[in-house]
């Protein structure tokens, strides 16, 4: 009789996670009598996957009836494949005995499991940053196989190039993870901007997964301050307004100081949003000139999003307001922005004096 050969026709089989895998094995001879065993891996540490003669293997079934007359087909079917099932499977013929004796092994079939990456999760910086600063966004996706994967970053639909990506582990594994960090330069117009992390993988059939983050979570747009005096009121009252413009987020506290003393504190709330996502707020203070002997120094103090306060001062000249008449008004804006602010539009940048 011909010498027995164990034939595993496929060198490799690729299966999607959750599906079933069929591992084919035939022998060329009925001799010697004895069982087939399937192992994952080779050598002393190999793992028994199926034993024709004994044992309980709930996820494994023989493809052909093992009791079939003169059966030489020992292919197996493994259900509900997971990435942990990846490896090389060997069909091994044993000769009946006590114990059974290994006769010959097949060449092995490598089972690779195609597992989809998890939905990418994009996380931004822990603290907000202002325009022209660079912030980092991180994108993570896990559990995919095979290792080959493509990750791209976009900001408002435009592809980014400043990012670094790592796929772990570097060696062979049942599944892999990807982590990418992109560096994004903020502008004052980024309140409504979005960064998108896009992951493409063979399991996704050309339909990449996306994770997003809103730059609104990462950006702070400091306000512009302007203090002005409105027309003189008839009853010796001066109306001074503090215009706080183009700020984000809305969290803002405004305090009026008269000659350094707190006059009123207000919190911004329920403000209408500008087209670019920023907010404006106007506060006014009525100053009774007749109650003052000297000039009044008014300060509009704005604390935005927990940052150090920004002041803008304005002097109301009392000497210009005769007590008996309120028609001749003279107010002077002597205030300076303790920070000058400007955005890309008006070509200022902010600094401390």
């Amino acid at each position: 009789e011909e010498e027995l050969q164990v034939i595993q026709p496929e060198k490799s089989v690729s299966v999607a996670a959750g599906d079933s895998a069929t591992l084919n094995c035939t022998v060329t001879s009925l001799i010697p009598v004895g069982p087939i065993q399937w192992f994952r891996g080779a050598g002393p540490g190999r793992e028994l996957i199926y034993h024709q003669k004994e044992g309980h293997f709930p996820r494994v079934t023989s493809v052909s009836e093992s009791t079939k007359r003169n059966n030489m087909d020992f292919s197996i079917h493994i259900s509900n494949i997971t990435p942990a099932d990846a490896g090389t499977y060997y069909c091994v013929k044993f000769r009946k005995g006590s114990p059974d004796v290994e006769v010959k092994s097949g060449a092995g079939t490598e089972l690779s499991v195609r597992a989809k990456p998890s939905a990418p999760v994009v996380s931004g910086p822990a603290v907000r940053a202002t325009a022209e600063h660079t912030v980092s966004f991180t994108c993570e996706s896990h559990g995919f196989s095979p290792r080959d994967i493509t990750l791209k970053w976009f900001k408002n639909g435009n592809e980014l190039s400043d990012f670094q990506t790592n796929v772990d582990p570097a060696g062979k594994s049942v599944s892999y993870s990807i982590r990418s960090t992109a560096r994004v330069v903020l502008t004052r117009r980024d309140v409504h901007s979005q960064v998108i992390c896009e992951v493409a993988h063979v399991t996704l059939q050309g339909d990449p997964l996306r994770g997003t983050a809103n730059l609104s979570e990462a950006i702070r747009v400091p306000p512009f301050l302007e203090v002005t005096q409105q027309s003189m009121r008839a009853d010796n009252q001066v109306n001074v307004t503090c215009q706080v413009t183009k700020f984000y987020p809305q969290r803002l506290q405004l305090t009026w100081l008269e000659n350094g003393n707190v006059s009123r504190t207000e919190m911004a709330s329920a403000l209408p949003e500008n087209k670019d996502g920023t907010y404006n707020w106007t506060s006014w203070l009525l100053v009774n000139v007749s109650a003052h002997r000297d000039d009044v120094k008014l300060t509009c103090q704005v604390e935005h999003d927990g940052q150090p306060a920004v002041n803008k001062s304005f002097s109301v000249k009392v000497s210009a307001h005769p007590k008996e008449q309120g028609s001749n008004t003279a107010a002077e804006n002597t205030g300076t922005n303790e920070r000058d602010y400007k955005d890309d539009d008006d070509k200022h940048h902010h600094h401390h004096h």
Partner: antibody, heavy 119, light 110 residues
């Protein structure tokens, strides 16, 4: 190791029935055929029938087709052979045997059950 | 049905001598390159024991003084050097179709 343990000796009257059991261990019961063979005192071996425990497929020797019934209980890995309408010439040792190579051969044997049919 | 006829019915052989038992089938028991003949040994009070499968293959644990040969319809079991423990009845069986046994050959020591 493979073991086939058979039920004890039976004495039956002509016309009665007997049911012999064979409990298998040391292997996956549903993966191998079970054969039943009998041997009358001082005589040779006579094949009765075989059963596939995985699906209860059976093959019978024509001589026994009308009187013998093979069954299995996979939950207890036990095979049964019932023989009806017993006659005195059914007196024999009844063996169960496992076919390890699916060659319709008998690789492992039970120790036998003596069935005596006598009035 | 295929009928198997063994010869001789009984045989006496001296210790250390060769013993030969024949089995003839009423029609060929060969199929797909295999000869579906099996040999069993049965000692008194014991169940039969498989010796040879598919005409010429020694079952594990069987001493190599036993051998089987033949094809088609004629088959032989040979014990090259008879030992005292070989005293038994020997049966051939075919499985080309549903199984049948030969009538048996009783082997004794001369």
């Amino acid at each position: 190791q493979v073991q086939l343990v058979q039920s004890g000796a039976e004495v039956k009257k002509p016309g009665a029935s007997v049911k012999v059991s064979c409990k298998a261990s040391g292997y996956t019961f549903t993966n191998y055929w079970i054969n039943w063979v009998r041997q009358a005192p001082g005589q040779g071996l006579e094949w009765i029938a075989m059963i596939d425990p995985s699906d209860s497929e059976t093959h019978y020797n024509q001589i026994f087709k009308d009187r013998a019934t093979l069954t299995t209980d996979t939950s207890t890995s036990t095979a049964y052979m019932e023989l009806r309408s017993l006659r005195s010439d059914d007196t024999a040792v009844y063996y169960c045997a496992m076919d390890y190579g699916s060659l319709y051969a008998m690789d492992y044997w039970g120790r036998g059950t003596l069935v005596t049919v006598s009035s | 049905d295929i009928v198997l006829t063994q010869s001789p019915d009984s045989l006496a052989v001296s210790l250390g001598e060769r013993a030969t038992i024949n089995c003839r089938a009423s029609k060929s028991v060969s199929s797909s390159g295999y000869n579906y003949i099996f040999w069993y040994q049965q000692k008194p009070g014991q169940p039969p024991k498989l010796l040879i499968y598919l005409a010429s293959n020694l079952d594990p644990g069987v001493p190599d003084r036993f051998s089987g040969s033949g094809s088609g319809t004629d088959f032989t079991l040979t014990i090259s050097s008879l030992q005292a423990e070989d005293v038994a009845v020997y049966y051939c069986q075919h499985s080309r179709e549903l199984p049948t046994f030969g009538q048996g050959t009783k082997l004794e020591i001369k």
